[in-house]
């Protein structure tokens, strides 16, 4: 379990359980719609996701000199990934199937940001907008473009634990 | 197997409120949205909104908004819905459902509005 | 809001007769569009969802067609317990919008 104030992060189940996500954003996409994707979405959804980008301290140097930083940004993510993953655009219709890997995928958002931010220690969190509905029509191809991008999130995030659990664990 | 039963018929005065139960079972109630669709004596239906309970969202149809308040309480995997300042055509059945492509329905709550 | 016209809004057939029931939404709303049959006293049951997707236990007699505006619900073989009424709904866009119905009589 991550401690607050500074302290490492319980590196190795993070890496265990960014792994999971990495196997499950990929078994959840493409999600096989009703229709193909003949509609262009809003892109107001996707827009604003939050990447990891080189001034997070994701890097083996800004990990080993302060990893709070990288994991305040990856906290950030995993929380906004699981409030779409919540909301009307995957739950809504067109209906996922009961045995859709996005349950769990939602599930292991929540477990990993967990693991990261335990009670009674609070990271500011980047304001995630209140989420407007999205039509139905929209939303096969917010979900492959959300689950895309998911993708790209959570393969960064292992990359950054698995460097974590080799080197910086304790 | 899929079951979503709701609460008991209403009858209600002018001006008053009523809150409808929805209690859902055989699926795992935060994956899709509950809908609340209505029906006047002898009328067609009417969607009045949905919620999604995972995150807690809502869409409400602008004919009620202001009047129509939904809930959930996942730990019992139940919806609400209320609707404020009954009027006598609020007189209707209302009904829960879960995602449309999925035909799951509960049986309907008579609520009789009359002074 | 996207208007759902349905015709006719009644109809009377003999047990055997081909149904045919047309739904017209005054905007496109691609194949976005549920079929439901309601009987007296409960709630409606999908038969097509889609424009065209079967749904597992509806008897195969049931049939829909159509895209954009125009859709059809077809009844091969009118049977007794196909005496209701049957909706088609906007399933497109908000607000949901349903047909004003059409009721199947026995002539």
């Known amino acids: 379990r991550a401690v607050p104030g500074g302290s490492s992060p319980a590196w190795t189940q993070c890496q265990q359980l960014s792994q999971k996500l990495c196997t499950l954003a990929w078994s959840a996409h493409p999600l096989v719609g009703h229709m193909d994707l003949r509609e262009e979405g809003d892109e107001e959804t996707t827009n604003d996701v939050p990447h990891i980008q080189c001034g997070d301290g994701c890097d083996p140097q800004g990990l080993r000199d302060n990893s709070q930083f990288c994991l305040q940004r990856i906290h950030q993510g995993l929380i906004f990934y699981e409030k779409l993953l919540g909301s009307d655009i995957f739950t809504g219709e067109p209906s996922l199937l009961p045995d859709s890997p996005v349950g769990q995928l939602h599930a292991s958002l929540l477990g990993l940001s967990q693991l990261l931010q335990p009670e009674g220690h609070h990271w500011e969190t980047q304001q995630i907008p209140s989420l407007s509905p999205s039509q139905p029509w929209q939303r096969l191809l917010l979900r492959f473009k959300i689950l895309r991008s998911l993708q790209a999130f959570v393969a960064v995030a292992a990359r950054v634990f698995a460097h974590g659990a080799a080197t910086l664990s304790p | 197997q899929v079951q979503l039963v709701q609460s008991g018929a209403e009858v209600k005065k002018p001006g008053a409120s009523v809150k409808v139960s929805c209690k859902a079972s055989?699926?795992?109630?935060?994956?899709?949205?509950i809908k609340w669709v209505r029906q006047a004596p002898g009328q067609g239906l009417e969607w009045m909104g949905e919620?999604?309970?995972?995150?807690?969202?809502?869409i409400y149809n602008e004919k009620f908004k202001g009047r129509v308040t939904m809930t959930t309480d996942t730990s019992t995997s139940t919806a609400y819905m209320e609707l404020r300042s009954l009027r006598s055509d609020d007189t209707a059945v209302y009904y829960c459902?879960?995602?449309?492509?999925?035909?799951?329905w509960g049986q309907g709550t008579l609520v009789t509005v009359s002074s | 809001d996207i208007q759902m016209t349905q015709s006719p809004s009644s109809l009377s057939a003999s047990v055997g007769d081909r149904v045919t029931i047309t739904c017209r939404a005054s905007?496109?709303?691609?194949?976005?569009l549920h079929w439901y049959q309601q009987k007296p006293g409960k709630a409606p049951k999908l038969l097509i969802y889609?424009?065209?997707q079967s749904i597992s236990g509806v008897p195969s007699r049931f049939s829909g067609s159509g895209s954009g505006t125009d859709f059809t619900l077809t009844i091969s073989s009118l049977q007794p317990e196909d005496f209701a009424t049957y909706y088609c709904?906007?399933?497109?866009?908000?607000?949901?919008?349903f047909g004003q119905g059409t009721k199947v009589e026995i002539k």
């Open positions: 459902a879960a995602n449309w492509d999925l035909d799951y």
């Open positions: 055989g699926y795992t109630f935060t994956s899709y949205g």
């Open positions: 919620i999604f309970p995972r995150s807690g969202q809502t």
């Open positions: 905007q496109s709303i691609s194949d976005y």
């Open positions: 889609y424009a065209s």
């Open positions: 709904q906007n399933g497109h866009s908000f607000p949901y919008t």
